[in-house]
Structures are given as C-alpha cells and as structure tokens.
C-alpha cells in the first residue's frame, strides 16, 4: 500500500489512522526534505489534490481538516513545492480507515445439517463496520468445562468430531475490530437437539384428471431420522399469501401429497422439515413450479423446471431458490 513508500517527512492523523466514521479528523504533513524550505504543501486523497481546509502551521508542517469523514478507506499523501524543483516532491503517504465498532452479535444459532459432520454456527452481526472485523466463537462444554475458540470472519463450521466434551455446550460469539469489541449472549445447546434432517426435495408433480382434478406432489429426503415433521407451502404465482400443509413423515419411501388446485394456474411449491419436536427447520427447498392443466392430465418433473418467463415455454418453470424473499432458510 501507500504506507510502503520512502518518506521525506511524516504524515499522521488525529485522532488516529483508524477512526469512527463521521468523525472530524485532521491530517498533518511535516516535510523533512534536504535543501528544501517548502513554498507550499499539498494533500492528495486517492490521487486527487485537496483544495480546501488546508492550514499552514509552520515552515515545514500543514494540516488538512475533514468534517464528518465518511469514506471507509482513503489513501492520503502529501507533497511539497520546493524552490528550484520543477515537480512536487513526495513527503509521505498513509492509508486511513473509518468505520464502526461491532454491534453485539445476536441471534446466535448452531445447527448440525445431517451428514455434514459439522456444527454450523451463524449470528446476526448487526450493522456493517467497514473495517476488518473478526469473530471468535467460544464453545464451552457444560460437562468438562473445556472451552474451544474459533476465529472467523463470518460463520463457522466446527467438526462434530472435535466436540469431545459430551452433548451439552454453551456457545457465544465475540466480535472485535480496531474500534471495539462486543460479546453475544450465551446459547445453550444439546447436540441431539440441533440436527436438521437431510434436505427435502420436490422431484415431480402430476395432475390427475378426475371428476375433481387433483395434483400429486412427489418429494423425498435421504434422512435417516425416524420422526420427521414437514411443511409444504404452495400458492398461485400471482398470489402473495402461502397456503401451508403439515405432515408427519416417514421417508422410507417417496412422499406423495395431494392438492386440489384451480385449473390453468401456475403454482409454486416448497417443502421443509425438522426432526419432530426439535427447534430448527430446514431452509425452504428450491421453488418448484407446476401449472395445472385446463383439462388434460399433466406431469411436471424437476428436470424440466425451466423459466417460462424467459424461455416462453408453456409448462414448467424454474426451481431455483432466489425468487422468494423468504427462502433464506427459516431455521429459527
């Protein structure tokens, strides 16, 4: 960075090179150039010369003042106009940063996705800090009192093999950067209570032409958990409101769920499951689209989930998960 240049003087910041966003700051430049009594001292921010709020303090030093500095990062350098020198002479440079101390991490959540071999812990970090902020996840066994710490920039995956202190743990998160530190409340967990079953997936749909046409949704999961509760939500793509059906499920075979839907309407389906009686749900599955026929029976399979809005196809639509605002994983 700019801090690696050879200096003929010094540049510094009051209050400091890392400071809270919105502060008033002063940047000082002090020349120490051989055979040069600077006629003028210039400041540059990100390569652009500053024109205002510059005060000459003495023969070798000048000050640049910023009110309410809001840039997360800036490269500052200063130069001198020396007599008999055609070009400005570089004095020194410094990278400055502004941001915020971290908020108290909240909504600490730890789950074990079946087959992952990891405990995944996440939290709400709060407002953006703009500066390098690290998180230390503390995991303390309630049985052995042993504590482990994991350093991360966001979430953390902790191998379940490393959790040797029994089943009960306290988990908390410490956030820290150069402007401060905060600590979350402690979350008490039992490893058996935080397992989320292997993802449930909708594979296909068919509408059977009967007196009252019915649509069958086929869905499955690779879970080995015996008692699983699931929810399937569905709506017409033109609607805002979801309808939800609940199921107690045994995944020894593919699930078939029946729905009586309006003809000639495009519907969207999603499913999610949890171990019965436990706290955390899977995130909702990818969107699965199915258009009910006017009269003719119709099958929609996952393999044919294309985007009708883009492709102009009349049947199936996309099953990617980014089209719904509440598809971010309701595990709370």
């Amino acid at each position: 960075g700019i801090t690696n240049i050879n200096c003929s003087g010094h540049i510094w910041v009051e209050p400091a090179t890392i400071f809270k966003m919105g502060m008033n700051i002063s940047i000082y430049c002090q020349a120490a150039i051989k055979n040069c009594q600077p006629r003028k001292l210039h400041f540059y921010k990100n390569g652009i010369k500053e024109r205002f709020q510059i005060t000459r303090i003495n023969k070798t030093t000048a000050r640049l003042w910023y009110k309410n500095f809001l840039e997360p990062h800036a490269s500052m350098y200063c130069t001198a106009e020396c007599p008999k020198h055609f070009q400005e002479t570089l004095i020194c440079g410094k990278d400055i940063s502004s941001g915020y101390p971290p908020d108290i991490p909240d909504e600490v959540t730890c789950v074990i996705y079946e087959y992952s071999g990891n405990m995944t812990c996440t939290w709400n970090a709060g407002k953006l800090t703009y500066i390098d902020t690290k998180y230390v996840v503390h995991v303390k066994s309630l049985e052995t009192e042993e504590e482990q710490q994991y350093l991360t920039s966001s979430y953390i995956n902790i191998s379940t093999d490393s959790l040797q202190g029994g089943k009960k743990y306290l988990v908390w998160v410490q956030a820290a950067n150069a402007l401060g530190m905060e600590e979350s409340k402690q979350l008490q967990i039992h490893l058996d209570d935080i397992v989320i079953p292997s993802a449930a997936v909708i594979s296909r749909a068919e509408t059977i032409n009967a007196t009252v046409p019915k649509t069958i949704i086929y869905w499955d999961s690779q879970t080995t958990i015996e008692k699983v509760s699931c929810e399937m939500r569905y709506k017409a793509t033109t609607n805002q409101t979801w309808n939800v059906k609940e199921f107690d499920t045994n995944f020894t075979y593919v699930q078939q769920s029946e729905f009586y839907l309006e003809p000639n309407i495009k519907y969207v389906f999603q499913v999610r499951c949890q171990e019965t009686g436990k706290r955390y749900w899977q995130p909702w599955s990818s969107l699965f689209f199915h258009k009910t026929p006017e009269t003719v029976p119709q099958v929609t399979s996952k393999a044919f989930q294309h985007d009708t809005w883009n492709s102009g196809l009349t049947v199936a639509s996309i099953s990617t998960g980014h089209l719904t605002s509440d598809n971010r994983g309701d595990i709370g």
């Epitope: 801090t3 010094h10 510094w12 910041v13 009051e14 209050p15 400091a16 090179t17 809270k20 502060m23 008033n24 002063s26 000082y28 101390p101 390098d132 690290k134 350093l151 820290a176 950067n177 150069a178 402007l179 401060g180 530190m181």
Partner: antibody, heavy 119, light 108 residues
Framework: EFQLQQSGPELVKPGASVKMSCKAS????????MHWVKQSHGKTIEWIGY????????SYNQKFKGKATLTVDKSSSTAYMELRSLTSEDSAVYTC????????????WGQGTTVTVSS | DIVLTQSPAIMSASLGERVTMTCTAS???????LHWYQQKPGSSPKLWIY???NLASGVPARFSGSGSGTSYSLTISSMEAEDAATYYC?????????FGSGTKLEMK
C-alpha cells in the same frame, strides 16, 4: 511539554469503589484517545479500554466491562476511571496513556496510580 | 484475543553485544499496528518503536525493529548499559488490544 498527571495512591477495602483521575496538559485533550491499562506486580500490561474525549465514545476490554467506567471532563482536560466492587485481584498500578496522532500509538503515559485493595 | 508471546522471557547481554528478542502473535497483525515499549522499574512504559520498524523520538539508532504477519522482532546492534529494561510488544490491530508478557533484558 505534554504531560499526563495522575491522582495519588489509593488504599481501599474489598467491595468498595475508587475513582482516579488523569489530567492532560500541553496538547488538545479532545483530539486524542485516552487509554487506560492495568499492570499487576510481576505481570504483563492489560488494556482496560479507551475514551475519545471529543465525543465521549468508549470501548472496553470485555474482561473489564462492569468493572471499569471511563469518563472525561473536557473543561478541565481530565480523564477519569472508576473501578467498582474491588477485590484483591484489582490491586495494581493503573495508568492512562494518550493514543493517536504522530505515532498512532500510546505515546505519552501518566505516572500511574497504585490501588491497593485490603481489609 | 490476539495473544502476543515474547521470547526469551529473560536475557542478559554484555556491553557491545548484539541482542534480538521476538514477539509472536497468535493471529496476523498489521505491521502498522505493532509497537514496542520500554519499561524500567518504577516508571511507566515508554513508546520505543512504532509501526514495527520506526524509532520513537529520542530512541538511539542502535535499536531496530522488523517483522510482518505473526512474527516480529526488536534488535539492539550493540548493547549499552542504559538498554537494560523490560520490552513489551503491543498490538492494536484488533480489540482487546494486547501486550506481550515482556522480555527482561539485563546487563551481564
């Protein structure tokens, strides 16, 4: 000449509180962070926290939250630290230090205030 | 917390001897935010080397500092009697700001 003058030694009983001061002179008090550290006999230096006099913003070491409270009086260019619920573990030398500016470091230190907690 | 481990804890050197002490951080620290302080008995610490390699005002040129990432060092090219003191490394890369446990340098 820059100077940080701290209040005198304190002998206090367990469970009591103590408030020490650090008077700054020779520079613009509000332009620099004021940090506080603890040094127990034969032990390393522990950072307690800082205060920015201009805004009153504070940041604490988690270990000292609830133990230390930092304040300033801008009119007298004085920083204060109050320690509460004192125990023998709190017996130490507590020092204020100016931070920032030219060195971007704790460049000027007070002489320290010795706190002895004893019944 | 970033733990700074200094070694050796105690060392002694003869007049004119070259001295090197190290400071190892438990996680990476920006060289701009790694400083060294000198402390003598009965006194408060004094800023000695700032931003890894820059000498504070009044510090003799026989002192130097270097390092990056997790490994830093302070070197005295030729030991003098007045250099006998405890030297602490310090990081303010990330809160809580921490100090090393110190290297006590004695005169042989």
């Amino acid at each position: 000449e820059f100077q940080l003058q701290q209040s005198g030694p304190e002998l206090v009983k367990p469970g009591a509180s103590v408030k020490m001061s650090c008077k700054a002179s020779g520079y613009t008090f509000t332009n620099y962070y004021m940090h506080w550290v603890k040094q127990s006999h034969g032990k390393t230096i522990e950072w307690i926290g800082y205060i920015y006099p201009n805004s009153g913003d504070t940041s604490y070491n988690q270990k000292f939250k609830g133990k230390a409270t930092l304040t300033v009086d801008k009119s007298s260019s004085t920083a204060y630290m109050e320690l509460r619920s004192l125990t023998s573990e709190d017996s130490a030398v507590y020092t204020c230090a100016r931070f920032g500016g030219f060195y971007d470091a704790m460049d000027y230190w007070g002489q320290g205030t010795t706190v002895t907690v004893s019944s | 917390d970033i733990v700074l481990t200094q070694s050796p804890a105690i060392m002694s050197a003869s007049l004119g001897e070259r001295v090197t002490m190290t400071c190892t951080a438990s996680s990476s620290v920006s060289s701009s935010y790694l400083h060294w302080y000198q402390q003598k008995p009965g006194s408060s610490p004094k800023l000695w080397i700032y931003s890894t390699s820059n000498l504070a005002s009044g510090v003799p040129a026989r002192f130097s500092g270097s390092g990056s990432g997790t490994s830093y060092s302070l070197t005295i090219s030729s030991m003098e009697a007045e250099d006998a003191a405890t030297y602490y490394c310090h990081q303010y890369h990330r809160s809580p700001f921490t100090f090393g446990s110190g290297t006590k340098l004695e005169m042989k």
